[in-house]
């Protein structure tokens, strides 16, 4: 029955980018400007998303697909489909209600987004700390102390802090 009904339904022939216009005897009409339909057989077209303010257009709206937004420099996307933009912080910081704050000792953030995370506990895996952690960097774990030759130092000081380029997430 469903299959028979769909064969008889003129709207099922309307492709993506059009809608089935009830006001015009169910003729397939193109989506009006600033609207789209991503699937066939639709009775209305959806309004295109507009990327305004802190959002910027990553992909323009077309008759068959919605616009996609990302965030202006200094902000990063949050949520499905970049539903929100959140302020960037520097590496070694996290965003709090009071703005960007430095990571506490024993924590780090090597990105411009997200929270400060505890340094990895190397001993959890029977390893030792090879390179000390900083606000911007996790520790690097190395062999267990027993694996080191006598007199060998196990800890390397971290490389000088700098801010490597970071891909927007």
């Amino acid at each position: 029955f469903e299959r028979t009904r769909s064969l008889q339904d003129p709207c099922s022939n309307c492709p993506a980018g059009t809608f089935c216009d009830n006001n015009r005897n169910q003729i397939c009409s193109p989506c009006p400007p600033n609207s789209f339909s991503s699937a066939g057989g639709q009775r209305t077209c959806d309004i295109c998303r507009q990327c305004k303010g802190v959002f910027r257009t990553r992909k323009e709206c077309s008759s068959t697909s919605n616009a996609e937004c990302d965030c202006t420099p200094g902000f990063h996307c949050l949520g499905a489909g970049c539903s929100m933009c959140e302020q960037d912080c520097k590496q070694g910081q996290e965003l709090t209600k009071k703005g960007c704050k430095d990571c506490c000792f024993g924590t780090f953030n090597d990105q411009k987004r997200g929270i400060c995370r505890p340094w990895t506990n190397c001993s959890l895996d029977g390893k030792s700390v090879l390179v000390n952690g900083t606000k911007e960097r996790d520790v690097v774990c190395g062999p267990s102390p027993a694996d080191l030759s006598p007199g060998a130092s196990s800890v390397t000081p971290p490389a000088p802090a700098r801010e490597p380029g970071h891909s927007p997430q």
């Epitope: 997200g114 990895t120 506990n121 190397c122 996790d138 490389a159 490597p164 891909s167």
Partner: antibody, heavy 119, light 107 residues
Framework: QVQLVQSGAEVKKPGASVKVSCKAS????????INWVKQAPGQGLEWIGN????????NYNQKFKDKATITADKSTSTAYMELSSLRSEDTAVYYC????????????WGQGTTVTVSS | DIQMTQTTSSLSASLGDRVTISCRPS??????LNWYQQKPDGTVKLLIY???RLRSGVPSRFSGSGSGTDYSLTISNLEQEDIATYFC?????????FGGGTKLEIK
């Protein structure tokens, strides 16, 4: 024994989705990053993204942001990667990896899962 | 993104040879450079991390060196089981990137 065991090979049609799993055993799943890496036929390795299972925090390579979704299930110590809107260029071996104690290197690799996209 | 260049895509050497594979990142990666071995069956193994640290269980004939934008992996006494493709990888900056690989063959 510390290992990552991935799900079996998949053959999918263009436009379909696929979800690859990576089951961890022999270590505390929530304490290490799980990464996903792509290797197209005859090509090199590409980092797709990673997840910290403890809080499901993810990072993605911008190139794969609209292609891959990485999740983790702490109760089964399993990480997943779903690939959507498959195209022929998604045909590849996909590896899951675990870090060496910080996110900067990968000491443990799964055996790889071959995903073939063909009409 | 940081580009990782392995200039030699394939290399032929004799058993017992000393082989050096180079890797050049497009910017300073502060020693966050790792080397992996991929066998013909697809198995991947971490050999060296943080430029020169040998992973436990890896034979001492493997060594790594370098700094800044110039790194290398050396196999001091090539054995049959070393036939594989070797990849470098930077862990300095997201997205983490790999070199194109160097395939090592026996003459």
């Amino acid at each position: 024994q510390v290992q990552l065991v991935q799900s079996g090979a998949e053959v999918k049609k263009p436009g379909a989705s696929v979800k690859v799993s990576c089951k961890a055993s022999g270590y505390t799943f929530t304490s290490y990053w799980i990464n996903w890496v792509k290797q197209a036929p005859g090509q090199g390795l590409e980092w797709i993204g990673n997840i910290y299972p403890s809080d499901s925090y993810t990072n993605y390579n911008q190139k794969f942001k609209d292609k891959a979704t990485i999740t983790a299930d702490k109760s089964t110590s399993t990480a997943y990667m779903e690939l959507s809107s498959l195209r022929s260029e998604d045909t590849a071996v996909y590896y899951c990896t675990r870090d060496y104690g910080s996110a900067y290197s990968y000491s443990l690799w799964g055996q790889g899962t071959t995903v073939t996209v063909s009409s | 993104d940081i580009q990782m260049t392995q200039t030699t895509s394939s290399l032929s050497a004799s058993l017992g040879d000393r082989v050096t594979i180079s890797c050049r990142p497009s910017q300073d990666i502060s020693n966050y450079l790792n080397w992996y071995q991929q066998k013909p069956d697809g198995t991947v193994k971490l050999l060296i991390y943080y430029t020169s640290r040998l992973r436990s269980g890896v034979p001492s004939r493997f060594s790594g060196s370098g700094s800044g934008t110039d790194y290398s992996l050396t196999i001091s006494n090539l054995e049959q089981e070393d036939i594989a493709t070797y990849f470098c990888q930077q862990g300095d900056t997201l997205p983490y990137t790999f070199g194109g690989g160097t395939k090592l063959e026996i003459k």
